[in-house]
Interface confidence: low
């Protein structure tokens, strides 16, 4: 094939090489940009800035190499449109720094920055961490800061992300109240801050106020749905981003639901309880307090992180006819109480029989290895057994 006379020439099926001296000063309008997976640029001393618009349309780009060029600045959002980028080689340019935001959101397997006149400052603390943690092939490059020695030796004691403190009301919050939250931001070189409220949906009307270093947030006419929802304050500086999430506890009375008993390994009387603060629970059996034991006990399911409702079971291990009856769950918190009842029948009473019928009776033998004198259940020995419960 004849040599390619253009500034950029195809390389393989989806690559482009731009190596003609000084032919580029930006990456706009590269041929076949939308299908490129590899872009190699060299000897472009006029290419000094890399910005968001330069890489627009390069959505398939995996490998980007800009070497021995004049690159002085890479915008923090430069790679927003190249989420698949996995290899980035910017060696032997004029870069003094590179923001942590530039690589945020990318899954870079390789980041090459050797041969740049890097300036050691807190803005490169993220890169120092990459070196410490062996990421992106950075340790092998033994990066130096221009006139300052190895990046690894850069003092970093003062290089912290912002410190956030979110003040929430001490007093109880009731449905319908207005709540003021304040986020105090401390730290060096603060750049941006704000609130993340994606979980709130219809939980309250939101009004933001103030700016750095003190951000205000009013949640008006709160509902009980606000419970367990994260309200997040975030702030960024040249070192990185910090986020602090808080939750507002909105008080509301206890409520309870009971469902029909189901056999799930053991029997389960499913229930749901709600309320803030979380209600205390008490079971009644046929109107009397049910004392929980290892064979009849309350078991909660893993709570969902973003809701106050708790689901669970009254677990009954091998219940018999003596456990048949009326089960009541009482739930109470300082704002109210609730109860629900359900009839459960686990087994027919074997003693309610027609005198004419034969009586199939079996008792499990005592296990001689047992340390207690209690009968030990033997499964599948007989199709039917009578248990005698002594209360």
């Amino acid at each position: 094939a004849a040599p390619c006379p253009d500034a950029c020439c195809p390389h393989g099926s989806s690559g482009l090489r731009c190596t003609r001296d000084g032919a580029l000063d930006s990456l706009h309008h590269l041929p076949g940009a939308e299908n490129l997976t590899e872009l190699y640029i060299e000897n472009q001393q006029h290419l000094q800035h890399l910005e968001l618009r330069d890489l627009r349309g390069l959505g398939e780009l995996r490998n980007l190499t800009i070497v021995k060029s004049g690159l002085r600045f890479v915008a923090p959002d430069a790679f927003h449109f190249t989420p698949r980028l996995s290899r980035l080689n910017l060696s032997f340019n004029a870069l003094e720094s590179l923001s942590w935001k530039t690589v945020q959101g990318l899954s870079l397997q390789e980041l090459v920055l050797s041969g740049n006149p890097l300036h050691c400052s807190c803005a490169l603390r993220w890169l120092q961490r990459w070196e410490e943690e062996g990421l992106g092939g950075v340790p092998e490059q033994k990066l130096q800061c221009h006139g300052q020695g190895p990046l690894a030796h850069m003092p970093n004691a003062s290089c912290g992300v912002p410190t956030l403190k979110v003040q929430v009301p001490n007093a109880s919050v009731d449905v319908g109240d207005d709540v003021l939250l304040r986020c105090q931001v401390e730290g060096r070189g603060l750049e941006q801050a704000g609130w993340i409220l994606t979980e709130l949906e219809q939980s309250a009307t939101v009004m933001k106020s103030g700016g750095l270093p003190s951000l205000g947030l009013t949640l008006a006419n709160v509902t009980s749905d606000l419970n367990r929802k994260n309200v997040t304050c975030w702030a960024e500086n040249d070192v990185g981003r910090a986020e602090v999430s808080v939750q507002v506890n909105v008080s509301f009375p206890a409520s309870v639901q009971l469902h029909t008993a189901v056999e799930m390994h053991h029997w389960c009387i499913p229930f749901s309880v709600d309320g803030q603060p979380a209600p205390s629970l008490r079971w009644l059996f046929n109107g009397s307090v049910l004392n929980e034991t290892s064979f009849i006990f309350t078991e909660f399911l893993e709570p969902a992180a973003n809701e106050t409702v708790r689901h669970g079971c009254l677990r009954l291990n091998q219940p018999t006819h003596v456990n048949n009856g009326n089960y009541t769950l009482l739930a109470a918190n300082p704002f109210g109480q609730a109860s629900a009842s359900i009839m459960a029948a686990f087994m027919d009473n074997p003693f309610e029989f027609n005198p004419e019928d034969p009586i199939p009776v079996s008792f499990s033998p005592v296990d001689t290895n047992s340390t207690s004198g209690d009968p030990v259940e033997k499964k599948d020995e007989t199709p039917f057994g009578v248990s005698v419960a002594v209360g």
Partner: antibody
Framework: QVQLVQSGAEVKKPGASVKVSCKSS????????MHWVRQAPGQGLEWMGE????????NYNEKFKNRVTMTVDISISTAYMELSRLRSDDTAVYYC??????????WGQGTTVTVSS | DVQLTQSPSSLSASVGDRVTITCSAS?????MHWYQQKPGKAPKRLIY???KLASGVPSRFSGSGSGTDYTLTISSLQPEDFATYFC?????????FGQGTRLEIK
């Protein structure tokens, strides 16, 4: 709450090695550097080195570089410091201390190592 | 290595006194950190980043300084403040401590 619990006192002969452990709880072990600092009787504090559990990276004080080995076992959130070729002037209390953004926020209770023939 | 020299090495003072301990570095350090140690106990972080009080530290303690010269001040000595104080730099490897200042009851 954060706790760094160190292994018990040791008595060693000159030329032997000692391995001190520091078990962490109450925080994400891998997110914090672990330092080792020693203090000879009636003396000041001497930094021996540090290790970052996330990467296994270590920095040693040159003074100890050929005799000290710092390791971690992430599965049990424990850091170790082994000092070899012990001399009588290695008799000291050895401390572990953790740091993240600020220096040595929390310290172990110390492990006394006595080197005596 | 960055040498840290504390002065005085020991100091006698009375409850209620204002006490100042200085720490001089052999070369410039970005920040200084201070620890308090009582006999038989591990050091406890007192002040970090030159002037920030560690959690739970009373406001009578303060720190200041820059470059090579740093100061720890106790505005009004309390009985529980009699201890040994160390400065520490976290700006270059190896991390180094001052030799300590022993604060005794007069």
């Amino acid at each position: 709450q954060v706790q760094l619990v160190q292994s018990g006192a040791e008595v060693k002969k000159p030329g032997a090695s000692v391995k001190v452990s520091c078990k962490s709880s109450g925080y994400t072990f891998t997110n914090y550097w672990m330092h080792w600092v020693r203090q000879a009787p009636g003396q000041g504090l001497e930094w021996m080195g540090e290790i970052y559990p996330n990467s296994g990276r270590v920095n040693y004080n040159e003074k100890f570089k050929n005799r000290v080995t710092m390791t971690v076992d992430i599965s049990i959130s424990t850091a170790y410091m082994e000092l070899s070729r012990l001399r009588s002037d290695d008799t000291a209390v050895y401390y572990c201390a953790r740091s993240r953004y600020d220096p040595m926020e929390d310290w172990g209770q110390g492990t006394t190592v006595t080197v005596s023939s | 290595d960055v040498q840290l020299t504390q002065s005085p090495s020991s100091l006698s003072a009375s409850v209620g006194d204002r006490v100042t301990i200085t720490c001089s570095a052999s070369s410039s350090v970005g920040y200084m950190h201070w620890y308090q140690q009582k006999p038989g106990k591990a050091p406890k972080r007192l002040i970090y980043d030159t002037s920030k009080l560690a959690s739970g530290v009373p406001s009578r303690f303060s720190g200041s300084g820059s470059g090579t010269d740093y100061t720890l001040t106790i505005s009004s000595l309390q009985p529980e403040d009699f201890a040994t104080y160390f400065c520490q730099q976290w700006s270059s490897i190896p991390l180094t401590f001052g030799q300590g200042t022993r604060l005794e009851i007069k």
